[in-house]
């Protein structure tokens, strides 16, 4: 499956939007940092099958969409930027979904990748729990925003590796 050229441009735009969502200087939030235990192994493509990678990427973007579409995120972040961000993520999801459809005939059911998808979901649960514990403070949002930028950039790298394997 060939992801369209617009897909990587969309990734870049999503990262820029995330960067623009900053509401407080991270220099002021150093004490609030937290290790969310990003599931790095799910993004290392040593034995990765393409369909598995696409499923993991899809889950990553879906969970990012869920995280940023809560009423708490709307209250804490710029709504115009959020709306643009949703559009980019929605496009990413559509691109990946059409890829999954093409790959399904080649490889067995995505149930094979349940562990990988579960690891991504648990990662986002840890992020949500952190925000709740920190009462959705501006520094907590800054920590989460920076974390999502980092994980998003790692998932972009995986997509680049997939493309180079084609």
């Amino acid at each position: 499956c060939d992801l369209p050229q617009t897909h990587s441009l969309g990734n870049r735009r999503a990262l820029i939007l995330l960067a623009q969502m900053r509401r407080i200087s991270p220099f002021s939030c150093l004490k609030d940092r937290h290790d969310f235990e990003f599931p790095q192994e799910e993004f290392d493509d040593k034995q990765f099958q393409k369909a598995q990678a696409i499923s993991v990427l899809h889950e990553m973007i879906q969970q990012t969409f869920n995280l940023f579409s809560t009423k708490d995120s709307s209250a804490a972040l710029d709504e115009t930027l959020l709306d643009e961000f949703y559009i980019e993520l929605d496009q990413q999801l559509n691109d990946l979904e059409s890829c999954v459809m093409q790959e399904v005939g080649v490889i067995e059911s995505p149930l094979m990748y349940e562990d990988s998808i579960l690891a991504v979901r648990k990662y986002f649960q840890r992020i949500t729990l952190y925000l709740t514990e920190k009462k959705y403070s501006s520094c907590a949002w800054e920590v989460v925003r920076a974390e999502i930028m980092r994980s998003f950039s790692l998932s972009i790298n995986l997509q680049k590796r997939l493309k180079s394997k084609e």
Epitope: L15, A19, R22, C29, M149
Partner: antibody
Framework: QVQLVQSGAEVKKPGSSVKVSCKAS????????ISWVRQAPGQGLEWMGG????????NYAQKFQGRVTITADESTSTAYMELSSLRSEDTAVYYC??????????????WGQGTLVTVSS | DIQMTQSPSSLSASVGDRVTITCRAS??????LNWYQQKPGKAPKLLIY???SLQSGVPSRFSGSGSGTDFTLTISSLQPEDFATYYC?????????FGQGTKVEIK
């Protein structure tokens, strides 16, 4: 690869100001933090403050508050540090240092070559 | 502000020696400690971050340990290019602060 190129050495009179530039290449300029660190002759390292270009607002060490201004120009990928009301004890090598992209600004991953500022009457 | 105190301020050692430098923070900084190497006339270079993580491209003879207030940088077998000044730096909170440095000289 990542490179930070600073402006040349300066000799200034006490009471005047100096503005040092730091041109960055490699990575997305707007999305990482740049700090300024100084080192007086034979002395240790001292963090003055830092900025994230896309955010715009700088953070300063209390010691330099009111005397230092850190800015960034995204169009030229250049950061600036201006220090006013110079005194002899401001004689030092001034470094710009870049923090890792998408990370919290906690470690100095890349450094400029340094700019010697001499304050003398 | 968090004060960082390094010891010793200087030491003499020979090639092949095991060298240990310590850094103490005035309050707990978890594992938010970095180590740098600086040679005369050059900018500092990051060696270790988050107390014990080796920066990419740094030889494995360098290692870091500790958490809370007490930290250690160890060079397992000193090489000629390791003669330099070493600084610790806390990144727990702003202002980011450095130790006063430890100069490693040839015996």
């Amino acid at each position: 690869q990542v490179q930070l190129v600073q402006s040349g050495a300066e000799v200034k009179k006490p009471g005047s100001s100096v503005k040092v530039s730091c041109k960055a290449s490699g990575g997305t300029f707007s999305s990482y933090a740049i700090s300024w660190v100084r080192q007086a002759p034979g002395q240790g390292l001292e963090w003055m403050g830092g900025i994230i270009p896309i955010f715009g607002t700088a953070n300063y060490a209390q010691k330099f508050q009111g005397r230092v201004t850190i800015t960034a120009d995204e169009s030229t990928s250049t950061a600036y540090m201006e220090l006013s009301s110079l005194r002899s004890e401001d004689t030092a090598v001034y470094y710009c240092a870049r923090h890792l992209e998408y990370a919290f600004p906690d470690k100095f991953d890349y450094w400029g070559q340094g700019t010697l500022v001499t304050v003398s009457s | 502000d968090i004060q960082m105190t390094q010891s010793p301020s200087s030491l003499s050692a020979s090639v092949g020696d095991r060298v240990t430098i310590t850094c103490r923070a005035s309050q707990s900084i978890s594992s938010y400690l970095n180590w740098y190497q600086q040679k005369p006339g050059k900018a500092p270079k990051l060696l270790i971050y988050f107390a014990s993580s080796l920066q990419s491209g740094v030889p494995s003879r360098f290692s870091g340990s500790g958490s809370g207030t007490d930290f250690t940088l160890t060079i397992s077998s000193l090489q000629p290019e390791d003669f330099a000044t070493y600084y610790c730096q806390q990144s727990y909170s702003t202002p980011l602060t450095f130790g006063q440095g430890t100069k490693v000289e040839i015996k």
